[in-house]
Interface confidence: low
């Protein structure tokens, strides 16, 4: 008996998602089944279905399949979140490249290589032919899309609409051409799903035919989507387990991108004298292990054979015989020249945190004249003279050009958070440098902290429609979703920007996140008309120690009666004690009978000194923190969410004065909550919004 192939690997999975048909003419077919694999097999074979199956949803609660002749890209269809649903879309219909000869290509390209529009397969004008959809069932000869029903050499083709040209191939790239990676592909998140020998990859969430440790839920930041090639373990390049029981795993053929520069999030901070973190960015010249035994050269196979070669581990700087950490070990190491000792750690290299005599700055660093020329994320600074136009755009005085020499970190705009520089990277135009304030320096970066000389409010009124506040009063509240579940709150401060907390991002893969706006219910129930779901395109981390993140949306939010922005306070302002404020959040972890609706807790502002007393002196607040306490028992930010706002009103204007972050206690009586003080970071926020490019709507 021939073993039936498991076809679920041919589908792209979107967890906790279903498709809703807006167009009632669209057909669907349902049936009770036990597993998603059964749904997949039937969809692939189109067995007993009155249409060509392009996608299906598996309803885990009802153990039911819903087969569709459409997918999420079809018109008349919308995606919807649902705990019990998993959406599977046939990759052939959403792929825009070909594998091999493109026999399985089912995309929507309908133009030939020379730019001629294709003739519909069902038409005999201008060219008569025998390639009728009815004769080639399963080959998807739909519309006038390029196809390769017989698997011919040139790849997908079509009859053309030009009477002079009977047929021509279409210019659809090979998937291996489209896909590219940087370095050894640890950050690769592409859609290659077969190995270099053509074997189909095993899904990461399956344990057959090969059991393995790389379970997506255990490694949320490794991008283990479907069965795509990945490099989670520092191999020379991306790989996958295969569906061949006799081939456990194989590398994938993914070429190196022409511009082989690493993504900002993947670059460890480069150091030469000391170790930062696990030392993955150590680029110094120590070349013995801890006990003095010399290191073996990385490009040598004697006395120890190994695959940690410079060719296999590009971007890891495996030069000479220097200690390095190319594989995510505890610290830099090397193979040794002693045949009896294969590897050893170079634990004699000091830790950066412990090394003294490091560069430092006083006050806000506006007089810093050191030679550091690298940002905290490891990017090399670009020359100041190339960036003067940008600098003039956000400062209103002439910078001291004598200080802006070379590409050294400087603070020409009086930034409260220290020296910075431009990077030359369009995604990260500028960033702070990894320099700390000098030990013992007490120069305040904001003057007159405890005297309310600066009002927090600008002179703008709260928007009111027909004299009644609309839901605009919470329209700035954002639900940050992580893999379809609410994880954190956030505040919409500009159409493309959300202010939230650093702790809200367990994964580096931005595909894992969405921002939901215009909702009142944590699951969006009853909010369908007003809900906006936006992808996240970038995270900008706040100044060191701030715990803030500015989250850039992939497209601007549309401001309406349900979605609005909230104002920021003036930089360095102080809000009077006893000012009434509120914290907002969905409090999704706390209450047994929680109804899923946005909750509010009313607090009042408390001075930092009094706040410290209420914490029995165990907490010392600094200028970057703000304190607010509850009058009633059981109300406070613990019922809200991390990332959510502390909102206060001054001169009839509401503003976000604080951000809820973990680790500072709850607002119970005599134990006020401590928030990140937004006024302290307001200049940073404005500077990011001004200098980072945002997509146009």
């Amino acid at each position: 008996q021939r073993k039936r192939r498991n076809t679920i690997h041919e589908f792209k999975k979107s967890a906790k998602t279903t498709l809703i048909k807006i167009d009632p003419a669209l057909k669907i077919k349902t049936k009770k089944v036990n597993t998603a694999d059964q749904c997949a097999n039937r969809c692939t074979r189109n067995k007993g279905l009155p249409f060509t199956c392009k996608a299906f949803v598996f309803d885990k609660a009802r153990k039911q399949c819903l087969w569709f002749p459409f997918n999420s890209m079809s018109s008349g269809v919308k995606k919807e979140f649902g705990h019990e649903f998993d959406l599977y879309e046939n990759k052939d219909y959403i792929r825009n490249c070909i594998i091999g000869k493109g026999r399985s290509y089912k995309g929507t390209v309908s133009i030939t290589k020379s730019g001629i529009k294709c003739q519909p397969w069902s038409s005999m004008i201008p060219h008569e032919h025998s390639f009728l959809p009815s004769s080639y069932r399963g080959k998807d000869l739909q519309e006038n899309y390029c196809r390769n029903p017989r698997g011919e050499e040139g790849g997908p083709w079509c009859f053309t609409s030009n009477p002079e040209v009977r047929y021509e191939v279409c210019d659809i790239p090979q998937c291996s051409e489209v896909e590219c990676m940087t370095c050894n592909g640890e950050s690769y998140r592409g859609l290659m799903d077969h190995t270099e020998s053509g074997k189909i990859c095993q899904r990461w969430d399956h344990q057959t035919p090969h059991r393995h440790k790389f379970l997506p839920e255990r490694y949320p930041d490794k991008g283990f989507d479907d069965n795509y090639c990945r490099n989670p373990d520092g191999q020379p390049r991306p790989w996958c387990y295969t569906l061949d029981p006799h081939t456990r795993w194989e590398y994938c053929a993914i070429k190196t991108c022409a511009d082989n520069t690493m993504n900002d999030t993947d670059v460890p901070l480069e150091t030469t004298e000391c170790i930062q973190g696990q030392g993955e960015g150590y680029r110094g010249t120590v070349n013995t292990i801890w006990n003095g035994i010399p290191c073996q050269r990385w490009d040598s196979q004697y006395p120890h054979e190994h695959d940690m070669t410079p060719e296999n581990f590009k971007c890891k700087d495996l030069r000479e015989n220097y200690c390095r950490n190319p594989d995510g070990s505890e610290s830099p190491w090397c193979f040794t020249t002693d045949p009896n000792i294969r590897v050893g750690y170079c634990s004699q290299i000091p830790n950066c945190d412990m090394s003294h005599g490091q560069d430092c700055y006083r006050g806000n660093g506006k007089n810093y004249m050191g030679n550091l020329s690298q940002t905290r994320s490891g990017l090399t600074c670009s020359m100041w003279d190339k960036n003067m136009e940008d600098l003039h755009r956000h400062i209103f005085w002439e910078p001291d050009a004598s200080k802006l020499n070379e590409n050294y970190c400087r603070n020409p705009d009086d930034d409260a958070h220290g020296p910075w520089c431009y990077t030359g990277n369009p995604l990260i135009p500028w960033d702070y440098c990894p320099i700390s304030r000098c030990e013992g320096d007490t120069t305040p970066t904001i003057v007159n902290l405890d005297h309310p000389v600066i009002s927090c409010a600008k002179t703008k009124q709260l928007r009111v429609v027909n004299g009644i506040p609309t839901r605009t009063n919470i329209g700035w509240m954002v639900s940050l979703r992580y893999r379809n579940k609410h994880i954190c709150g956030g505040s919409l401060i500009k159409e493309s920007w959300v202010l939230t907390a650093r702790q809200c991002f367990p994964s580096r893969d931005l595909k894992d996140y969405e921002a939901w706006l215009g909702i009142h219910d944590v699951h969006g129930r009853g909010d369908e008309k007003c809900k906006q779901v936006l992808n996240v395109s970038q995270l900008v981390y706040g100044p060191e120690g701030s715990d803030l993140v500015l989250m850039k949306l992939a497209r601007p939010a549309v401001l309406d009666d349900f979605v609005s922005t909230i104002d920021l306070p003036n930089y360095g302002c102080t809000i009077p004690e006893k000012t009434s404020c509120s914290v907002y959040g969905w409090g999704y972890t706390g209450l047994i009978n929680y109804d899923g609706l946005l909750r509010v807790a009313h607090l009042y502002i408390m001075g930092n000194e009094k706040c410290s007393q209420h914490h029995r002196g165990k907490v010392t607040l600094n200028e970057s923190e703000i304190c607010a306490g509850a009058e009633k028992i059981g109300s406070g930010p613990c019922e809200g969410d991390y990332g959510g706002p502390l909102v206060c009103e001054q001169h009839k204007m509401r503003m976000v004065l604080g951000v809820i972050v973990p680790g500072r206690g709850c607002a119970i009586p005599n134990r006020p909550g401590i928030f990140v003080r937004v006024a302290y970071y307001a200049k940073w926020i404005h500077k990011i919004i001004l200098t980072y490019k945002v997509p146009q709507s």
């Epitope: 344990q207 035919p209 090969h210 059991r211 440790k213 029981p245 505890e330």
Partner: antibody, heavy 120, light 108 residues
Framework: QVQLQQWGAGLLKPSETLSLTCAVY????????WSWIRQPPGKGLEWIGE???????NYNPSLKSRVTISVDTSKNQFSLKLSSVTAADTAVYYC??????????????WGQGTLVTVSS | EIVMTQSPATLSVSPGERATLSCRAS??????LAWYQQKPGQAPRLLMY???TRATGIPARFSGSGSGTEFTLTISSLQSEDFAVYYC??????????FGQGTRLEIK
């Protein structure tokens, strides 16, 4: 109670093929991975390879070219074949049960062991 | 492959005393480490897995600790039946699964 019973030829000449079988009694055969591990006289343990009920195998790269592990699910048995043996393959060969997922790659049940001697 | 190194090769301890056996991995194996006891003429017996979890039926005098590259098996008060050879085994990175060369625990 799970029991592993193993058998096979104990004396081989160089270049012959070693052949051992392990039968599993009790417990679920289809849930686990089944391994072969050997121990040369007076030395440590060396992992040879493993197989599951569907025939999916993993082998020690150092022995891969000579090893074949197969499974007969109808009898709850799995077998080891090691070709072109030399004196260096003289060892006690054990069959053992390993966990079904990555997080349980240890061996909780072992066969009694079979001493295989390679000598001309 | 990951090389497991056990020390010492032989450990002499008196009954009733405490024995501490070490195992080092050539690279991190997280907590995916097991310990076995083997007596002459017998198959190995699983003592610990996950670095610190006792297997079924193993007395409380056996305890395991460590993660990453450094691991320890401690026998708090040695009984006569504890004198044997002890092996550590990693299952974090395979194939191949690898064992240490063993530590012989003998009566002093």
């Amino acid at each position: 109670q799970v029991q592993l019973q193993q058998w096979g030829a104990g004396l081989l000449k160089p270049s012959e093929t070693l052949s051992l079988t392990c039968a599993v009694y009790g417990g679920s055969f289809s849930t686990y991975y089944w391994s072969w591990i050997r121990q040369p006289p007076g030395k440590g343990l060396e992992w040879i390879g493993e197989i599951n009920h569907s025939g999916s195998t993993n082998y020690n790269p150092s022995l891969k070219s000579r090893v074949t592990i197969s499974v007969d699910t109808s009898k709850n048995q799995f077998s080891l074949k090691l070709s072109s043996v030399t004196a260096a393959d003289t060892a006690v060969y054990y069959c053992a049960r390993g966990g079904y997922d990555f997080w349980s790659g240890y061996y909780d049940y072992w066969g009694q062991g079979t001493l295989v001697t390679v000598s001309s | 492959e990951i090389v497991m190194t056990q020390s010492p090769a032989t450990l002499s301890v008196s009954p009733g005393e405490r024995a501490t056996l070490s195992c080092r991995a050539s690279q991190s194996v997280s907590s995916n480490l097991a310990w076995y006891q083997q007596k002459p003429g017998q198959a190995p017996r699983l003592l610990m897995y996950g670095a610190s979890t006792r297997a079924t039926g193993i007395p409380a005098r056996f305890s395991g600790s460590g993660s990453g590259t450094e691991f320890t098996l401690t026998i708090s008060s040695l009984q006569s039946e504890d004198f044997a050879v002890y092996y550590c085994q990693q299952y974090n990175n395979w194939p191949p699964i690898t064992f240490g060369q063993g530590t012989r625990l003998e009566i002093k």
